[in-house]
């Protein structure tokens, strides 16, 4: 039975040209995390495998950095980065858990600074 829950940063905003940390946390389960996939809509951004380390999609390697932890740092943000991001946790023995984050990249300098994991 899957008892775990994914906590995410929820809806976050950042300024164009800036950086943001996407972070998820799996709680309420003793399941072992074997791999975390980061996806933007249906496009793979990165994989963090417990045994093999990180795979950053070549299309994003110049502006995606692994970490902190199982999170992902997006750099040089553009308005086109606005949208849904998903963290997909592969666990043993529970199976797969998915978390959702909505990122809004703002043109102006009035981006909210309330996001818990946001880089100032």
């Amino acid at each position: 039975m899957m008892t775990g829950t994914i906590e995410t940063t929820g809806n976050i905003s950042a300024e164009k040209g800036g950086s943001i940390i996407l972070q998820c946390h799996l709680s309420s389960t003793t399941a072992q995390v074997t791999q975390v996939n980061w996806e933007q809509q249906d496009q793979l951004l990165a994989i963090c495998n417990a045994d093999l380390g990180w795979h950053i999609s070549p299309s994003f390697k110049d502006r995606v950095a692994p970490g902190p932890g199982l999170g992902l740092t997006l750099q040089s943000l553009t308005v086109n980065d606005t949208g849904e991001y998903f963290c997909i946790y592969h666990t043993y023995p529970d199976g797969t858990y998915t978390g959702r984050i909505f990122l809004e990249v703002l043109e102006s300098s009035v981006a909210e600074h309330g996001a818990r994991f946001q880089i100032p």
Epitope: D51, G53, K61, H90
Partner: antibody
Framework: EVQLVQSGAEVKKPGASVKVSCKAS????????MHWVRQAPGQRLEWMGR????????KYNEKFKSRVTITVDKLSSTAYMELSSLRSEDTAVYYC????????????WGQGTTVTVSS | DIQMTQSPSSLSASVGDRVTITCRVS??????LAWYQQKPGKSPKLLVY???TLAEGVPSRFSGSGSGTDFTLTISSLQPEDFATYYC?????????FGPGTKVDIK
């Protein structure tokens, strides 16, 4: 066109080391991880390890961890695999292979380098 | 280590035949499975990754299916250039491991 061109065949004595090179072209070398895989005569393929050419960070198969070192030279877009303390069982064809877009599989392979270990 | 088995180990078939190769894995690897084709004296060539996604330039007669621990590579209509050895590989953990191969030869 993606190309991985490996160094030539090697004959080594037991206990020696061998260093195989793999020159990449046709793509941005630092954007794609590189794997090394070997195949002994008549045997299945055996994964040895992988490296991120950008950071130089590597991961190894525990079986080879004490004997294998994978490195890169970013300037020449070349990956290297060095295997030490050679024994006859290391006689195999050694391949470099570029990691794919969407995970830890390999989408392009070098032509292979035959390493023969014999006294 | 994740163990990979393939069946059959070899098969004889004719041009135009439908060929199915199976790969069984010792633990759940979700859909993280690749298939490669290798001809004698040549390097492996990627056919399928993520269990069912066809690699660039691979003919549509090849298809992959399965998830979890059981996977299949199907060649819908065997062509002369398809006579080769086929390997499955999981791409999910360290070490990455390959199946023993299935040799497809001419009947």
């Amino acid at each position: 066109e993606v190309q991985l061109v490996q160094s030539g065949a090697e004959v080594k004595k037991p206990g020696a080391s061998v260093k195989v090179s793999c020159k990449a072209s046709g793509y941005t070398f630092t954007n794609y991880y590189m794997h090394w895989v070997r195949q002994a005569p008549g045997q299945r393929l055996e994964w040895m390890g992988r490296i991120d050419p950008d950071s130089g960070g590597s991961k190894y198969n525990e079986k080879f961890k004490s004997r294998v070192t994978i490195t890169v030279d970013k300037l020449s877009s070349t990956a290297y695999m060095e295997l030490s303390s050679l024994r006859s069982e290391d006689t195999a064809v050694y391949y470099c292979a570029r990691e794919g877009h969407y995970g830890f599989y390999s989408d392009y392979w070098g032509q292979g380098t035959t390493v023969t270990v014999s006294s | 280590d994740i163990q990979m088995t393939q069946s059959p180990s070899s098969l004889s078939a004719s041009v135009g035949d439908r060929v199915t190769i199976t790969c069984r894995v010792s633990e759940n690897i979700y859909s993280y499975l690749a298939w490669y084709q290798q001809k004698p004296g040549k390097s492996p060539k990627l056919l399928v990754y993520n269990a069912k996604t066809l690699a660039e330039g691979v003919p549509s007669r090849f298809s992959g299916s399965g998830s979890g621990t059981d996977f299949t590579l199907t060649i819908s209509s065997l062509q002369p250039e398809d006579f080769a050895t086929y390997y499955c590989q999981h791409h999910y953990g360290n070490p990455l491991t390959f199946g023993p191969g299935t040799k497809v030869d001419i009947k």
